[in-house]
Structures are given as structure tokens and as C-alpha cells.
């Protein structure tokens, strides 16, 4: 066969799909490879053909669309599966084609079991909400061209191995799950359970996500530097080691980059010629604050190095701030047989 | 609130030397080093020389190590810049200033409000 | 010593106007340079540091750029209490040397 533009395997794409439930695919191609689409390729008489190879197996085989009930089947530049079998894992390639041109990907598809209460080896999308927030939802993912709008699906919430009833501060709406005010005490796994029926049979969607509740930005403020500051004097003689940790707290805020970094008289550490290491220490609260450590570290400290003008710098998405650690050069205390005896009259 | 407060206006003829005082508050000059810089009418900044208070160790740019010396009282938080040798090019206006942070700091956040020397026969 | 060159010594603008005042060195000074502002009472004050960053206290329609040997001041929207002359400083190198300074005067 004639060449064809193999875009590998895309792994960036690893979908993960729940045993014995729907799972519709689309061919990467047009989403993430391809500058046209599934409508604009077929009406320029280039057809899609799928293939997969099964897992821990090097062979390429045609999907078999002669299952019964349609079990798999294609849908313009959609792979179906009604329901997924444990065994349809493996790599799967969609190829376009016609006598000119071709262009294929390959990606992982894992069908994963779970247990009663939901658990399983998928990797869960985490859905941030603000505490103390007021009203915040989430909303049931990944349902969206699994039945018609005609059609209307029970949903049911649960968190953890728990169906949603009664609960205080969360109130399950149909595909929206509420969550009144928003505490700790909600982080978890929630997981909507979709039922539809299709062509007489039953079909069940299970989509689970972690809601991890964080820092509001009611109470976000500029990053907060706690050292250095000006209650310490880091006092050396020469040829002692001189750390200076800079502490900085950082409010959580949603896509913000946080920041420290040190100078030394004005400048970055490395256009300085001194021997100067910084290691970098993070930790998280239960919200997600931020307190970033960076230790600067001087092994063997000069009198001209302890002159020198050491400031920490911290930037958030609230603003930038910058704090100065007070060095000095310690002040040899007097030598007593000599400095002192001699104010005692010895001679 | 950091202030630092500059001698007045100076009179001097060729050849005499004149002192000029920066008096600072609001912080303890120990902790920060001191410059000085030198404006003449219609030009830029010149940077002088700084000391750091802390052991009177100086540094000057070298177009002025035979022309200024920079001295400290630490006791009355004063700085003082000494000129010697009096040329006319020497008529300008003499600034003292602080870095923003302690040390070796080159960010000059509180400036004085400048002494006028005069260089006249 | 690093020359700093700042061409245009004065700059007429209207209220209102976004002015850029820039700043040359004679050689790379890897952003090392600030920007301060002198009152025609001789008043100076700290603008901007480090190329871009802030000085507390100063408004935020001043805003600084620049890399390698070419640095800029920018005032977004001009106000009449930001009639000054501007001064670029460089740090990189010992000793410390400033522009000529750019008067900034109202239209």
C-alpha cells in the first residue's frame, strides 16, 4: 500500500471507558490532527476505516461490526461500543483515506472495572469548589451524544459508596449536582449513574470525579511573606555557612502561577559570582494554600558577602511582594586573657 | 517614615573644600548602605560613592576617588560627603539617598532633597 | 564605565496620551536597570526596578520592558503630576551609571 501520514500513538489521549457500559469514540484525527473535519473529509470522497490491535498482541485486525446486537458499531467519525467488553482493550487506529491520500492515529482505549461503590483504576477528573462560596454545581461529564434530546435519563448522585438523599448541603438536580455551601467535609468522590433506555434494552453511564474544595477568592490576598523579616539578624563571621530561608504563604487562586525567587544586590543568584545553592520546599493546606520554602545557602560565607543585599521575592495572580533578610557580620566578642585582663589593670 | 533631610545651600570659592550632611529618621542607618550622586544643571545623574555605616567601608566611582570622601556618624545618623580641591566643574547639586533594602541593595528609594554647591571666585 | 543614552531629552504630550520614554546601554545589562522620576521641585522618587517591577506606591499606568541593551518606560495614560524628567540607571556593572534624563512637558 502506498504511503499513509502515521501520527503514531497518541497517548496523550489514554481513554479509559467502564466495563458492560455505552463508550463513544471519536477519531482523533479531526480533533487534534487534521485541519478539516469528518463532513468536509466525506464529502471529498475520503472514507474513515478502523482497525485495533488487541492488547499485549502486535497484530492489526479489522474490527469485527457484524456482533451481535450491533455490540460495535460506526457512526460517522464515532466509534461505538453497546456495551464494552473487558477484552475490547487495546489499541485502536482510525485511518482516512482514498486513492491519493491517507492519514492515521492510533490511541489506548482500557475498559476498566469497578465495584459496587464505584472504585477502579480510572484516573478521576477533580472538580474545584470554592469554600464558603455560596451555590456551586457540577455537572454530570461526558454524557453529552449518548441519546437524544427526546429522551429523558434517571440520574443518580452518590458520594462515595452512598446514593445522595437528605444530605444537608448537597441536592442532586437531574444531571447538576448543588452543593449549597461548599465545606471540607464535601471533598470526595462523587459519582452520577445515568440510565437510559435504547432500542429495548437498558444502557447505564457511570461518571465519577473528585471534588477537592479550596481557598475562595473572597479571601484570596497577595502572597505573604512570613521570612525572611525583621525581627532576625542572620549574624556570621566569615567562613561560616549562611542559610536564609524565604517562607512565602500563597492564597490558593484557580490557574494562578505562584512564584518566589531570590536577588543578591539586585540580581539573580547565578549572574553573582558567589557559590549560592536554593533549594525550593512546597506544602498545601486542606484548601490548597500554598506555602513555598526557598532556602538560600551560602557554604562558606565572605565579609563582602555579608554586605550584600539578600531579598526574597513573591509573585502571585494578587500582586508581588518582596522582603530583605537583615545579614550582618558578626562582631568577634573580646578575647578575655588579653581584651578583658587588660581592663582589670593586668599588665 | 524614612526621611533624610540634606544641609543646605553652599557658597565656595576655587581650591576650598566644603562637607555637606545628610541627617536620615525612620531608620537605623546601620542597616543600609549610603550614597551619594551628583547633578549639574541640565545634565544627568553621577553616581559619587556610598559607605556602609555599619563599619565606614567606602567605594567611589573613579572619577571621584581624589574629589569626594564619604564619612558616617552613627550616633547622629549622619552622613556626610567631603569635596575637596574646588572647580567650577564642581557647581551641582549633591544628592544622598537610601536603597530600598538593606545591604549592598541598587534599587534608590529615598532620596534626599539635594544641597546646591556653588563654586565661585 | 556603561554608557546609558536616552536620545530624546525632552517629549511633548497631551493629558491623557501613552507616552514611551526609552533608555539604550552600551551593552547588555540583562535587565538590570530602573527608572526614576525627578520633579522639576528636585524631588526624585523610585519608579520602576528590575526592568518591570513596581515600586510600591506608584501608579499603575507606569509600566517598564525591555531586555539586552534597549529598555523602555511606558505612562498608559498621562496625568499633569507626571510632569518630571525620567532617568534610566543601570546596575549590571560597577560603578552604577544613569541617562541624561528625558523632560517630559505638557502640550
Known amino acids: 500500500s502506498e504511503r499513509c501520514d502515521d501520527w503514531g500513538l497518541d497517548t496523550m489521549r489514554q481513554i479509559q471507558v467502564f466495563e458492560d457500559e455505552p463508550a463513544r469514540i471519536k477519531c482523533p484525527l479531526f480533533e487534534h490532527f487534521l485541519k478539516f473535519n469528518y463532513s468536509t473529509a466525506h464529502s471529498a470522497g475520503l472514507t474513515l476505516i478502523w482497525y485495533w490491535t488487541r492488547q499485549d498482541r502486535d497484530l492489526e485486525e479489522p474490527i469485527n461490526f457484524r456482533l451481535p446486537e450491533n455490540r460495535i458499531s460506526k457512526e460517522k467519525d464515532v466509534l461505538w461500543f453497546r456495551p464494552t467488553l473487558l477484552n475490547d482493550t487495546g489499541n485502536y487506529t482510525c485511518m482516512l483515506r482514498n486513492t491519493t491520500y491517507c492519514s492515521k492515529v492510533a490511541f489506548p482505549l482500557e475498559v476498566v472495572q469497578k465495584d459496587s461503590c464505584f472504585n477502579s483504576p480510572m484516573k478521576l477528573p477533580v472538580h474545584k469548589l470554592y469554600i464558603e462560596y455560596g451555590i456551586q454545581r457540577i455537572t454530570c461529564p461526558n454524557v453529552d451524544g449518548y441519546f437524544p434530546s427526546s429522551v429523558k435519563p434517571t440520574i443518580t448522585w452518590y458520594m462515595g459508596c452512598y446514593k445522595i438523599q437528605n444530605f444537608n448541603n448537597v441536592i442532586p438536580e437531574g444531571m447538576n449536582l448543588s452543593f449549597l455551601i461548599a465545606l471540607i467535609s464535601n471533598n470526595g468522590n462523587y459519582t452520577c449513574v445515568v440510565t437510559y433506555p435504547e432500542n429495548g434494552r437498558t444502557f447505564h453511564l457511570t461518571r465519577t470525579l473528585t471534588v477537592k474544595v479550596v481557598g475562595s477568592p473572597k479571601n484570596a490576598v497577595p502572597p505573604v511573606i512570613h521570612s525572611p523579616n525583621d525581627h532576625v539578624v542572620y549574624e556570621k563571621e566569615p567562613g561560616e555557612e549562611l542559610l536564609i530561608p524565604c517562607t512565602v504563604y500563597f492564597s490558593f487562586l484557580m490557574d494562578s502561577r505562584n512564584e518566589v525567587w531570590w536577588t543578591i544586590d539586585g540580581k539573580k543568584p547565578d549572574d553573582i559570582t558567589i557559590d549560592v545553592t536554593i533549594n525550593e520546599s512546597i506544602s498545601h493546606s486542606r484548601t490548597e494554600d500554598e506555602t513555598r520554602t526557598q532556602i538560600l545557602s551560602i557554604k562558606k560565607v565572605t565579609s563582602e558577602d555579608l554586605k550584600r543585599s539578600y531579598v526574597c521575592h513573591a509573585r502571585s495572580a494578587k500582586g508581588e511582594v518582596a522582603k530583605a533578610a537583615k545579614v550582618k557580620q558578626k562582631v568577634p566578642a573580646p578575647r578575655y586573657t588579653v581584651e578583658l585582663a587588660c581592663g582589670f589593670g593586668a599588665t | 517614615e524614612v526621611q533624610l533631610q540634606q544641609s543646605g545651600a553652599e557658597l565656595v570659592k576655587p581650591g576650598a573644600s566644603v562637607r555637606l550632611s545628610c541627617t536620615s529618621s525612620?531608620?537605623?542607618?546601620?542597616?543600609?548602605?549610603m550614597h551619594w550622586v551628583k547633578q549639574r544643571t541640565e545634565q544627568g545623574l553621577e553616581w559619587v560613592g556610598r559607605?556602609?555605616?555599619?563599619?565606614?567601608?567606602?567605594q567611589y566611582a573613579p572619577n571621584f576617588q581624589d574629589k569626594a570622601t564619604i564619612t558616617v556618624d552613627t550616633s547622629s545618623n549622619t552622613v556626610y560627603l567631603q569635596l575637596s580641591s574646588l572647580t567650577s566643574e564642581d557647581t551641582a547639586v549633591y544628592y544622598c539617598?537610601?536603597?530600598?533594602?538593606?545591604?549592598?541593595?541598587?534599587?534608590?528609594?529615598?532620596w534626599g532633597q539635594g544641597t546646591l554647591v556653588t563654586v565661585s571666585p | 564605565d556603561i554608557q546609558m543614552t536616552q536620545t530624546t531629552s525632552s517629549l511633548s504630550a497631551s493629558l491623557g496620551d501613552r507616552v514611551t520614554i526609552s533608555c539604550r546601554a552600551s551593552?547588555?545589562?540583562?535587565?538590570?536597570l530602573n527608572w526614576y522620576q525627578q520633579k522639576p521641585d528636585g524631588t526624585v522618587k523610585l519608579l520602576i526596578y528590575?526592568?518591570?517591577t513596581l515600586h510600591s506606591g506608584v501608579p499603575s499606568r507606569f509600566s517598564g520592558s525591555g531586555s539586552g541593551t534597549d529598555y523602555s518606560l511606558t505612562i498608559s495614560n498621562l496625568e499633569p503630576e507626571d510632569i518630571a524628567t525620567y532617568y534610566c540607571?543601570?546596575?549590571?556593572?560597577?560603578?552604577?551609571?544613569f541617562g541624561s534624563g528625558t523632560k517630559l512637558e505638557i502640550k
Open positions: 539617598f537610601r536603597p530600598l533594602y538593606y545591604g549592598n541593595s541598587p534599587w534608590f528609594a529615598y
Open positions: 525612620g531608620f537605623n542607618i546601620k542597616d543600609y548602605f
Open positions: 559607605i556602609d555605616p555599619e563599619d565606614g567601608e567606602t
Open positions: 551593552q547588555d545589562i540583562s535587565n538590570y
Open positions: 528590575y526592568t518591570s
Open positions: 540607571h543601570q546596575y549590571s556593572k560597577f560603578p552604577p551609571t
